[in-house]
Amino acid sequence: KFSKQSWGLENEALIVRCPRQGKPSYTVDWYYSQTNKSIPTQERNRVFASGQLLKFLPAAVADSGIYTCIVRSPTFNRTGYANVTIYKKQSDCNVPDYLMYSTVSGSEKNSKIYCPTIDLYNWTAPLEWFKNCQALQGSRYRAHKSFLVIDNVMTEDAGDYTCKFIHNENGANYSVTATRSFTVKDEQGFSLFPVIGAPAQNEIKEVEIGKNANLTCSACFGKGTQFLAAVLWQLNGTKITDFGEPRIQQEEGQNQSFSNGLACLDMVLRIADVKEEDLLLQYDCLALNLHGLRRHTVRLSRKNPIDHHS
C-alpha cells in the first residue's frame, strides 16, 4: 500500500521521497531492503538519506532495488517502500515506455507541460526542453519555472517531451532528465466576454445576524479550456485579502465546471457570524478574462424573523 515506483538513468541524479509522510521533526531511517543495511546520512556518500528523501548522486544501475523508509512518529514507526530502478542510458533517441512519466494533454488554449519530479531537486532556471531528442527552439516555446508553454498548439506538437535540468548538492552539479508524452486534444473551443450567472446584478441577499452566509460568484467564459479566466470577490472595491476582515474569506481555489459544454468558474465568499456592519458593505462579484471584466454588485439585508413563519 505504501509503496512507490521510482526510476532514473545511470550517472544522473535521482531523488526519491518516502511514500510515508510525517512532520518535519520526525526522524526517517532508510534501509536497503535486500540486505537490511542502513543507508548513511553523511553527504560524502554517493547514496545517502536526508530526512524523507533518498539521494543517488549520481545513480548507478547496481542501486536498483527496494528501499525501506521508516518514519518514527511519537506513536508508531510507519513504514514505506521505494522500488527504485536505474536504467542504462540509451544510445539511440527513443525513450522506452518504462522511463516515461504520466501523459499530459493539452489544447490550443492550454498547453502546459510540467517537468516531472522536479520539485524534489535543488535546481535553478532555466530548464532545457527537448522533443523527440531535438532541443526546442523558436518563439512558440517558453520555458517558464517548472513547465513548458507551447503557443498556438497544433496536432503536430504531440510527442515525447524531455526536460533537463541541473541538481546542485553542496556545490556539485548533477544532470537530471525526465520524459513524458504530450497529446493534443482536438478541441474547437472559444472564449467570450464573461457572463455572470450568479449573483444577479444589484441582488439583495437576505442574511441572519450571527449566522454564517455564503455568496457564490459564478461565471462562464466560453467553451473548452480557457487560458486566462478568473472570478473573485471584492469588498467596497478592495480585494478580500486586503480588506482585513478574517470573518470574510474567499473559498480557496476556484471550482471549474462545464455547464452545457461551457467553461465556468465559481468562487464562494464565506461570511462567518454575520454582523450589522456587514450590511453596509458592497459585495462585488468580478469575472474577467482576455476579453475584459464584468462586475455584479450584491448587498446584504437583514432577514426579517417573521419570514420563518411564512
Partner: antibody
Framework: QVQLVQSGAEVKKPGASVKVSCKAS????????LHWVRQAPGQGLEWMGT????????VYNQKFKARVTMTADKSTSTAYMELSSLRSEDTAVYYC??????????????WGQGTLVTVSS | EIVLTQSPATLSLSPGERATLSCSVS?????MHWYQQKPGQAPRLLIY???KLASGIPARFSGSGSGTDFTLTISSLEPEDFAVYYC?????????FGGGTKVEIK
C-alpha cells in the same frame, strides 16, 4: 462521511473486564490508526493508547499497559478496547478517535459518541 | 511524560469579550492542538499544529506559541463558545492533554 460508532453503556463490578467496540465507516479502516481516550466524570481527557488496524500493532500508555488490550477486526472495520481488573476509578466515558490525516498527527479530528463504563459493587 | 498545565482553570467573561487561554508545557514540543468540549459531547478539534484552524471552525478562534508556551485566543466570544477547552501534545508518547480551562459566562 467519517463515522465512529461505539457500543452502549456498561455497568461492571470491580475486578471484572469490559470490552468497548468502535465501528468505523466512511473511510478505509486500515489506513488510519485508531486511538482511545477516556474521561472520568468532571475530569480531563486521558490518552490510553492506539492501534494500527492494518498490522494490529499497538502502543499503550504505560499507566494502562498491564490492563488494556486493543484489537481490530478488519473484516468488520471495528476496533475494540478491553480493560481488565476494573476498579471504581475506571468509571469514565471511553472515546475512540482518529486523526484527520494519518501521517501528520494533526490532532483528533473524528470522535466516537463515547461509551460510559460504570464500575460499581 | 510531558505535562501540560492550563491556566486559568476558569475564565469568567461576557459575550463579545476576548478570551486568552494558556497552556504551559513541562518540556519543549513542536506543535500544540486545541479542543472544545461541551457537556455531554465528545471533544471537537479547534486548532491543530499550533495555529491551523480545523475544518468548519470560525475564524474568531486562533492559536499561537512555541516551545513551552502556547495560547488559544477567541477574539470575540459568542454564546456558543462557553465550554471547556483542552490543549494536547503529540510530540512524544504518551500523548497528553492539559487539565482544561472552563470558559463561563460572567
Amino acid at each position: 462521511q467519517v463515522q465512529l460508532v461505539q457500543s452502549g453503556a456498561e455497568v461492571k463490578k470491580p475486578g471484572a473486564s469490559v470490552k468497548v467496540s468502535c465501528k468505523a465507516s466512511g473511510y478505509t479502516f486500515t489506513d488510519y490508526e485508531l486511538h482511545w481516550v477516556r474521561q472520568a466524570p468532571g475530569q480531563g481527557l486521558e490518552w490510553m493508547g492506539t492501534i494500527d488496524p492494518e498490522t494490529g500493532d499497538t502502543v499503550y500508555n504505560q499507566k494502562f499497559k498491564a490492563r488494556v488490550t486493543m484489537t481490530a477486526d478488519k473484516s468488520t472495520s471495528t476496533a475494540y478496547m478491553e480493560l481488565s481488573s476494573l476498579r471504581s476509578e475506571d468509571t469514565a466515558v471511553y472515546y475512540c478517535t482518529r486523526a484527520f490525516y494519518n501521517d501528520y498527527d494533526e490532532g483528533f479530528a473524528y470522535w466516537g459518541q463515547g461509551t460510559l463504563v460504570t464500575v460499581s459493587s | 511524560e510531558i505535562v501540560l498545565t492550563q491556566s486559568p482553570a476558569t475564565l469568567s467573561l461576557s459575550p463579545g469579550e476576548r478570551a486568552t487561554l494558556s497552556c504551559s508545557v513541562s518540556s519543549s514540543v513542536s506543535y500544540m492542538h486545541w479542543y472544545q468540549q461541551k457537556p455531554g459531547q465528545a471533544p471537537r478539534l479547534l486548532i491543530y499544529d499550533t495555529s491551523k484552524l480545523a475544518s468548519g471552525i470560525p475564524a474568531r478562534f486562533s492559536g499561537s506559541g512555541s516551545g513551552t508556551d502556547f495560547t488559544l485566543t477567541i477574539s470575540s466570544l459568542e454564546p456558543e463558545d462557553f465550554a471547556v477547552y483542552y490543549c494536547q501534545q503529540w510530540n512524544s508518547s504518551p500523548l497528553t492533554f492539559g487539565g482544561g480551562t472552563k470558559v463561563e459566562i460572567k
